[in-house]
């Protein structure tokens, strides 16, 4: 697991941004913009919402999501879960890496009250080449996208 | 354009801390302590609230602000916006990099209730030599400064 | 204080995770898992809740804690303080490094309301060999542990 940064290689890094297509409503992970605006990929890959590791090592992975609403949608759980999850070719289930639970709706005492909240996650995990990291938000109906600055997902090798 | 970390160079990094002079009330960005206590600059510069990049590259930039109040000030917007913005001499507008919106006042159901909240932002962006990054909070009246540990601003090259 | 990353050395990094034994109720810092699951130590050491620095340098240190409850326990302060603190052999008191204050209980308008909140801290600090960093949460009764993904503590040299 000893990881050395070779001088002729770039240090893997990425910052992916929220876009209109991020929220699929399909129960899958959030999708991200990889090339436009502030988004970039350097020494990492992307596939169907996932950052794909090309070089094994320890990575600081992070995500922020902007939450907001007017009161709370009917049927909305009082808990919002925002997490970073790992998919690996050798294991059938996603593995939780970093997770937060919040109750932002509880702030709005009236059903017509506008509220905003933000959830940030970041931490160091070991990732093997070919492993994938995705972002999930339950309930994603409360994620508020705009211009890629409020909801995002990134990583860099440490 | 490939950026490699050369082993004989220090890696640019900085951590700036909140101080009594941070809040100007002028509509400008927050100002920061760069030398005292926990604050430092290494391979980055500072000017009028801005971290100034001296070496182009990808940087993880971050900021935390401590918010608090007793109820909500009259005329206070229900949304607090905390953001990291880029300034450059050759571009007329500030560019949003990372932004959060929160409604912390909504937590206080009574007008005399004391409340606290914190907003953290962090992400990787590409910065050119000479470009500046600043922190803005709207409404800055709710930022609570103390000793440099609760509100801060930093960056390091990845 | 000039710090160079030598190419033949591993870059110090660690990620420690919350466990059933994390909350001691003794007024001491939180304790952490260092070896199981997602937890690891690489070029850093651990002792009684503290990350112990073995190589002097600038480190990005971070912690997240998951808070939650049903209403608010009697006698609970309305403010929760989550902080990263430094212990050094040459100084008798802990030094605050990065701190957040939150009022998550204020979200729950009824005493039987379930609420969740999360606090994230991260920033760059200079640490000498032998210095220790710990996490404290006041009141720790509101920290919700599960599987190491919701409350954690880590660092890496920048």
């Amino acid at each position: 697991l000893i990881q050395e940064r070779r001088s002729h290689e770039v240090n893997p890094a990425a910052h992916l941004t929220g876009a209109n297509s991020s929220l699929t409503g399909s129960g899958g992970p959030l999708l991200w913009e990889t090339q436009l605006g502030l988004a970039f990929l350097r020494g990492l890959s992307y596939h169907d919402g996932a950052l794909v590791v090309t070089k094994a090592g320890y990575y600081y992975i992070y995500s922020k999501v902007q939450l907001g609403g007017v009161g709370c949608p009917l049927g909305l759980a009082s808990t919002i879960t925002h997490g970073l999850y790992k998919r690996t070719p050798r294991y059938p289930e996603e593995l939780e890496l970093l997770v937060s639970q919040q109750s932002p709706c509880g702030r709005a005492t009236s059903s017509s009250r506008v509220w905003w909240d933000s959830s940030f996650l970041g931490g160091v995990v070991h990732l093997e080449a070919g492993e994938k990291v995705v972002v999930r938000v339950l309930d994603e109906r409360l994620v508020r996208l705009r211009d890629g600055t409020r909801s995002y997902f990134g990583a860099f090798m440490v | 354009l490939i950026q490699e970390r050369r082993s004989h160079e220090v890696n640019p990094a900085a951590h700036l801390t909140g101080a009594n002079s941070s809040l100007t009330g002028s509509g400008g960005p927050l100002l920061w302590e760069t030398q005292l206590g926990l604050a430092f600059l290494r391979g980055l510069s500072y000017h009028d609230g801005a971290l100034v990049v001296t070496k182009a590259g990808y940087y993880y930039i971050y900021s935390k602000v401590q918010l608090g109040g007793v109820g909500c000030p009259l005329g206070l917007a229900s949304t607090i916006t905390h953001g990291l913005y880029k300034r450059t001499p050759r571009y007329p507008e500030e560019l949003e990099l990372l932004v959060s919106q929160q409604s912390p006042c909504g937590r206080a159901t009574s007008s005399s209730r004391v409340w606290w909240d914190s907003s953290f932002l962090g992400g990787v962006v590409h910065l050119e030599a000479g470009e500046k990054v600043v922190v803005r909070v709207l409404d800055e009246r709710l930022v609570r400064l103390r000793d440099g540990t609760r509100s801060y601003f930093g960056a390091f090259m990845v | 204080l000039i710090q160079e990353r030598r190419s033949h050395e591993v870059n110090p990094a660690a990620h420690l995770t919350g466990a059933n034994s994390s909350l001691t109720g003794s007024g001491g810092p939180l304790l952490w898992e260092t070896q199981l699951g997602l937890a690891f130590l690489r070029g850093l050491s651990y002792h009684d809740g503290a990350l112990v620095v073995t190589k002097a340098g600038y480190y990005y240190i971070y912690s997240k804690v998951q808070l939650g409850g049903v209403g608010c326990p009697l006698g609970l302060a309305s403010t929760i303080t989550h902080g990263l603190y430094k212990r050094t052999p040459r100084y008798p008191e802990e030094l605050e490094l990065l701190v957040s204050q939150q009022s998550p209980c204020g979200r729950a308008t009824s005493s039987s309301r379930v609420w969740w909140d999360s606090s994230f801290l991260g920033g760059v600090v200079h640490l000498e060999a032998g210095e220790k960093v710990v996490v404290r949460v006041l009141d720790e009764r509101l920290v919700r542990l599960r599987d190491g993904t919701r409350s954690y503590f880590g660092a890496f040299m920048v």
């Epitope: 090339q35 020494g43 794909v52 090309t54 | - | -």
Partner: antibody
Framework: QVQLVQSGAEVKKPGASVKVSCKAS????????IYWVRQAPGQGLEWIGY????????KYNQKFKDRVTMTRDTSISTAYMELSRLRSDDTAVYYC???????????WGQGTLVTVSS | EIVLTQSPDFQSVTPKEKVTITCRAS??????LHWYQQKPDQSPKLLIK???QSISGVPSRFSGSGSGTDFTLTINSLEAEDAATYYC?????????FGQGTKVEIK
């Protein structure tokens, strides 16, 4: 230094297919996307699509999506762009270009002239 | 799609003169605008990225400015080797698009 070397000129008949190659050197091939851009004689530049060399993921301009296929062979650090059902207005110089992470292009191949003529 | 319209289409300029080429976007593209130079029978060459950012190895006489929908490439003191066609490109929305080009000729 980064180099992108493309295959030689091709002459094709309408309805045929052409496959242009782009061999990369001077960097780790899987680290950056490869884009394809074309330029008809005396005309401007037109984006065709890109490929992620690591996993073969692609994004195509809607205008070409029914006719273009981008592939790669990581063992020889080479990307390919195949255009099928060629028409005379596909006559152009086809360029591969490499990003530095986002959608702008500091590195370009020398271009491959594809002539479609009956 | 975002349409980029350059003006003028053609410019004949004497050496040492200042050259200004504009690029107008059909909708706001923030600062996500890049400039390329292409000489006859050569590949395009990146001159400026993100509206104003200079590129290593590109002479300092080339500069960029603008924001939102209106952008400018300036060549401060034209040299004979600058005879070429110049293109703008946006990276704000898919599909990526280029301007139609501005040909600069030396008088």
């Amino acid at each position: 230094q980064v180099q992108l070397v493309q295959s030689g000129a091709e002459v094709k008949k309408p309805g045929a297919s052409v496959k242009v190659s782009c061999k990369a050197s001077g960097y780790t091939f899987t680290d950056y996307y490869i884009y394809w851009v074309r330029q008809a004689p005396g005309q401007g530049l037109e984006w065709i699509g890109y490929i992620d060399p690591y996993n073969g993921g692609t994004k195509y301009n809607q205008k070409f999506k029914d006719r273009v296929t981008m592939t790669r062979d990581t063992s020889i650090s080479t990307a390919y762009m195949e255009l099928s059902r060629l028409r005379s207005d596909d006559t152009a110089v086809y360029y591969c270009a490499r990003t530095s992470g986002s959608s702008w292009f500091p590195y370009w191949g020398q271009g491959t002239l594809v002539t479609v003529s009956s | 799609e975002i349409v980029l319209t350059q003006s003028p289409d053609f410019q004949s300029v004497t050496p040492k003169e200042k050259v200004t080429i504009t690029c107008r976007a059909s909708q706001s593209i923030s600062n996500n605008l890049h400039w390329y130079q292409q000489k006859p029978d050569q590949s395009p060459k990146l001159l400026i990225k993100y509206t104003y950012q200079s590129i290593s190895g590109v002479p300092s006489r080339f500069s960029g400015s603008g924001s939102g929908t209106d952008f400018t490439l300036t060549i401060n003191s034209l040299e004979a080797e600058d005879a070429a066609t110049y293109y703008c490109q946006q990276s704000n929305r898919w599909p990526l698009t280029f301007g139609q080009g501005t040909k600069v000729e030396i008088k």
